[in-house]
Interface confidence: low
């Protein structure tokens, strides 16, 4: 499977609220034995490989902004604590997966990433990996709500896994 | 079954460091969460940070940051806990443990604890 | 940090006895507690996950319920290997942190 990021670049008045996406592509394996780990974190430009640098958003790491199916559903020992930081992640059973940022500031632009691992236990993982970009505008000059930019369709399809 | 393994008991004087390791055998390493956990002759259990392998960063408690490192070693399955500046107080047994699901904080393996005693 | 206290710190009981044991939060921490058992100079062993899920091959006679900050740990009908150390634990924020423990000592 892959990761796609529909849109590469949002930009977004400060104070809005904004919905960061991507969508898991290609045969999905719903066996028994396989957990699929989703989670964000922020990272920053000009390295080797983007996304491989790990940054909390708004204090919160990757460990805090996990999604995880199959198997049980353990204690949510995160959902309290994203959204008093005004963060709130979220998956579909169609791949699409989330983090929604409430109540923006300047200091939340910068380049986010989504990170799947399928994990088959006892035996192997996979891991993959989106990138975008949150510019967040104050003064005359920004819009009035959102506005996103779609990817490339290059830019969707080559994902390197992590 | 999932089965984890700790180093020996060891014995420091004060000031110096103490490395522990706990190795994990018969399931996935990488993405389940190992933490330290200590427990003081005669006293309770305190957590001391955590970190899942797969990602390789891990979180501390703030009584201990800037005094212990954890870190894990993915080829091995072997996590790591460092603890500088020994006082006596350090005297303990220290466990890991791994998360039940993923990147929870509810400990369902534990090792079989390294007692470390800290003594001039 | 959040605080967890459990109550009592010790308790006498006889074989058949039900047992109740509290813990509280110094804030609301959902349903993000656990129970673990523990024997001397073993390490602990997780009894019940998520306040009340009770986790693989643990025993019925043990049960957990509460949310928010009070949480209960029941063992209906004690055994002679109960005889332990119980802890509580949140998980809902870091530092993750444990009561103080309660030594179930036989009668």
């Known amino acids: 499977f892959k990761v796609a990021t529909p849109y590469s670049l949002y930009v977004c008045p400060e104070g809005q609220n904004v919905t960061l996406t991507c969508r898991l592509l290609g045969p999905v394996d719903k066996g028994h034995d396989v957990t699929f780990y989703k989670t964000w974190y922020r990272s920053s430009r000009g390295e080797v490989q983007t996304c491989s640098e790990r940054r909390p958003i708004r204090n919160l790491t990757f460990q805090d902004l996990h999604l995880h199916h199959g198997g049980h559903q353990a204690a949510n020992t995160s959902h309290d604590l994203a959204q008093r930081h005004g963060l709130e992640s979220a998956s579909d059973h169609h791949g699409n997966f989330s983090i929604t940022m409430r109540n923006l500031t300047l200091l939340d632009s910068g380049l986010y990433c989504c990170l799947v691992v399928e994990i088959r236990h006892h035996h192997s993982e996979h891991r993959v990996h989106g990138a975008m970009e949150l510019q967040v505008q104050t003064g005359k000059d920004a819009p009035s709500n959102c506005v996103v930019y779609p990817s490339s369709s290059q830019d969707s399809e080559n994902i390197t896994a992590a | 079954q999932v089965q984890l393994v700790q180093s020996g008991a060891e014995v420091k004087k004060p000031g110096s460091s103490v490395k522990v390791s706990c190795k994990a055998s018969?399931?996935?390493?990488?993405?389940?969460?190992i933490s330290w956990v200590r427990q003081a002759p005669g006293q309770g259990l305190e957590w001391m940070g955590g970190?899942?392998?797969?990602?390789?960063?891990?979180n501390y408690a703030q009584k201990f940051q800037g005094r212990v490192t954890i870190t894990a070693d993915e080829s091995t399955s072997t996590a790591y806990m460092e603890l500088s500046s020994l006082r006596s107080e350090d005297t303990a047994v220290y466990y890991c443990a791994r998360s039940s699901y993923g990147w929870s904080y509810e400990f369902d393996y534990w090792g079989q604890g390294t007692l470390v005693t800290v003594s001039s | 940090d959040i605080q967890m206290t459990q109550s009592p710190s010790s308790l006498s009981a006889s074989v058949g006895d039900r047992v109740t044991i509290t813990c509280r939060a110094s804030q609301s921490i959902a349903t993000n507690l656990n129970w673990y058992q523990q024997k001397p100079g073993k390490a602990p062993k997780l009894l019940i996950y998520?306040?009340?899920s009770l986790q693989s091959g643990v025993p019925s006679r043990f049960s957990g319920s509460g949310s928010g900050t009070d949480f209960t740990l029941t063992i209906s009908s004690l055994q002679p290997e109960d005889f332990a150390t119980y802890y509580c634990?949140?998980?809902?924020?870091?530092?993750?942190?444990f009561g103080q423990g309660t030594k179930v000592e036989i009668k």
């Open positions: 998520a306040a009340s």
């Open positions: 970190i899942i392998p797969i990602f390789g960063t891990a």
């Open positions: 018969g399931g996935t390493f990488s993405s389940y969460a």
């Open positions: 634990q949140q998980n809902d924020d870091r530092p993750i942190t």
